[in-house]
């Protein structure tokens, strides 16, 4: 969490941003809140990016003002206009790409004063893993697949029965570049699996951590997946 204040004491307002991550090929949200004003026409929101000459987005007098917008962001940005009055200056970014990563500044002007806060925005790819029993294998084998990751993640297997065991010797992980030549498909195979046990396939990079669990008994197979973003720090 980053909390920024205006420069001149009495005329400063609190602006708060949260470091976040964007999944490339989807819309992303850059979070920013501020002390609200009672009059929408008195609020100015400017989003800037370090190293970019033009503005990322500007909202003033109750509407978008995009004449100074940088070409890189043309047609891709929006604030939640109906929520500005309650202090939400968050930015929606369409079709996030790797190049959108960087340091952004949320700069606010209201009748109470000015304030700003920086936000670190990471971009990458992350997806839910799916763990299945590989019936084609000669021994009891589990196969963990996740379609899109970037940067290259680490993959670790764990088991409920053998807690703390190191499965690196009995697993094999491969990374296959996807057609857009950025993200990769993750495939990890775990050998010598025992029945009546819960196994977890944990995939992690500096942006996200995802876990796929599978419980194999003689009568049924139960699966569960979970994904968590790692870098949500507020400023």
């Amino acid at each position: 969490l980053i909390i920024g204040f205006g420069i001149s004491g009495r005329h400063s307002i609190t602006v708060t941003t949260v470091a976040s991550a964007g999944n490339i090929g989807e819309d992303g949200i850059l979070s920013c809140t501020f002390e609200p004003d009672i009059k929408l026409s008195d609020i100015v929101i400017q989003w800037l990016k370090e190293g970019v000459l033009g503005l990322v987005h500007e909202f003033k007098e109750g509407k978008d003002e995009l004449s100074e917008q940088d070409e890189m962001f043309r047609g891709r940005t929006a604030v939640f206009a109906d929520q500005v009055i309650v202090g939400n200056a968050s930015l929606r970014l369409k079709n996030v790409q790797l190049t959108d990563a960087g340091t952004y500044k949320c700069y606010i002007i209201t009748s109470k004063g000015k304030g700003n806060a920086n936000l670190e925005y990471k971009t990458g790819a992350f997806s839910m893993p799916e763990v299945n029993v590989d019936y084609n294998a000669s021994s009891e084998t589990l196969r963990c697949e996740a379609p899109r990751w970037f940067p290259q993640p680490t993959v670790v297997w764990a088991s409920q029965v053998d807690q703390g065991a190191n499965f690196s010797e009995v697993s094999n992980t491969s990374f296959e570049l996807n057609s857009e030549n950025v993200t990769m498909k993750v495939v990890s195979v775990l050998y010598n699996v025992t029945i009546n046990n819960t196994y977890s396939c944990m995939i992690e990079n500096d942006i996200a951590k995802a876990t796929g669990d599978i419980k194999v008994t003689e009568s049924e197979i139960k699966r569960r997946s979970h994904l968590q973003l790692l870098n949500s720090k507020a400023s």
Epitope: L66, G75, V79
Partner: antibody, heavy 116, light 109 residues
Framework: EVQLVESGGGLIQPGGSLRLSCAAS????????MNWVRQAPGKGLEWVSV???????DYADSVKGRFTISRDNSKNTLYLQMNSLRAEDTAVYYC??????????WGQGTTVTVSS | EIVLTQSPGTLSLSPGERATLSCRAS???????LAWYQQKPGQAPRLLIY???SRATGIPDRFSGSGSGTDFTLTISRLEPEDFAVYYC??????????FGQGTKLEIK
């Protein structure tokens, strides 16, 4: 040249299924938001479905649960699987690329007629 | 659900005249996510304007877009014979993800 070419339309009975294809050239389908948009005879444009660059999908309420959008990255091709077809699904179906700032590339359209 | 209402439904003008087409949204739309398309009979739509006011590649400068919030306008400063067609506005970002207006037919007077 950047191009989209649809195929797979035709005459189908109510309740039937059809799969539309959209072959792309000159750009990579998986880097863009790819859409299906339809136009009933004499009517306006109606958005049907999107597949994001990430592979996630979204649908108009009118087709949710009946239509499935997908893509084959190796073939650079977009698909629309249409099941439980109804008379009101009769339309010209266009695939369109949204290159961040609007649907800038459209196919020529393929006609789907649902009639008994 | 955001509804886009275009007016007039039909606009009858002569070549050389100025055309003003309106698109009104039922709730606020980001200027970035507002586009205009032209469609001629038997053809696919063509992107004219994106981001409410930016001309798409290859679009003549007689076409211009303006507006913000809930009111957007497409202006054709001097009508050419090839400009007579149906025009649609479209928004992105709400549910449904994309919404089109019902269209304005620009016909020769």
């Amino acid at each position: 040249e950047v191009q989209l070419v649809e195929s797979g339309g035709g005459l189908i009975q109510p309740g039937g299924s059809l799969r539309l294809s959209c072959a792309a050239s000159g750009f990579i389908v998986s880097r863009n938001y790819m859409n299906w948009v339809r136009q009933a005879p004499g009517k306006g444009l109606e958005w049907v479905s999107v597949i994001y660059g990430s592979g996630r999908t979204d649908y108009a309420d009118s087709v949710k649960g009946r239509f499935t959008i997908s893509r084959d990255n190796s073939k650079n091709t977009l698909y629309l699987q249409m099941n439980s077809l109804r008379a009101e699904d009769t339309a010209v179906y266009y695939c369109a690329r949204d290159a961040d700032y609007g649907m800038d590339v459209w196919g020529q359209g393929t006609t789907v007629t649902v009639s008994s | 659900e955001i509804v886009l209402t275009q007016s007039p439904g039909t606009l009858s003008l002569s070549p050389g005249e100025r055309a003003t087409l309106s698109c009104r949204a039922s709730q606020s739309v980001s200027s970035s996510y507002l586009a205009w398309y032209q469609q001629k009979p038997g053809q696919a739509p063509r992107l004219l304007i994106y981001g409410a006011s930016s001309r798409a590649t290859g679009i003549p400068d007689r076409f211009s877009g303006s507006g913000s919030g809930t009111d957007f306008t497409l202006t054709i400063s001097r009508l050419e014979p090839e400009d007579f067609a149906v025009y649609y506005c479209q928004q992105y970002g709400s549910s449904p993800l994309y919404t089109f207006g019902q269209g304005t037919k620009l016909e020769i007077k």
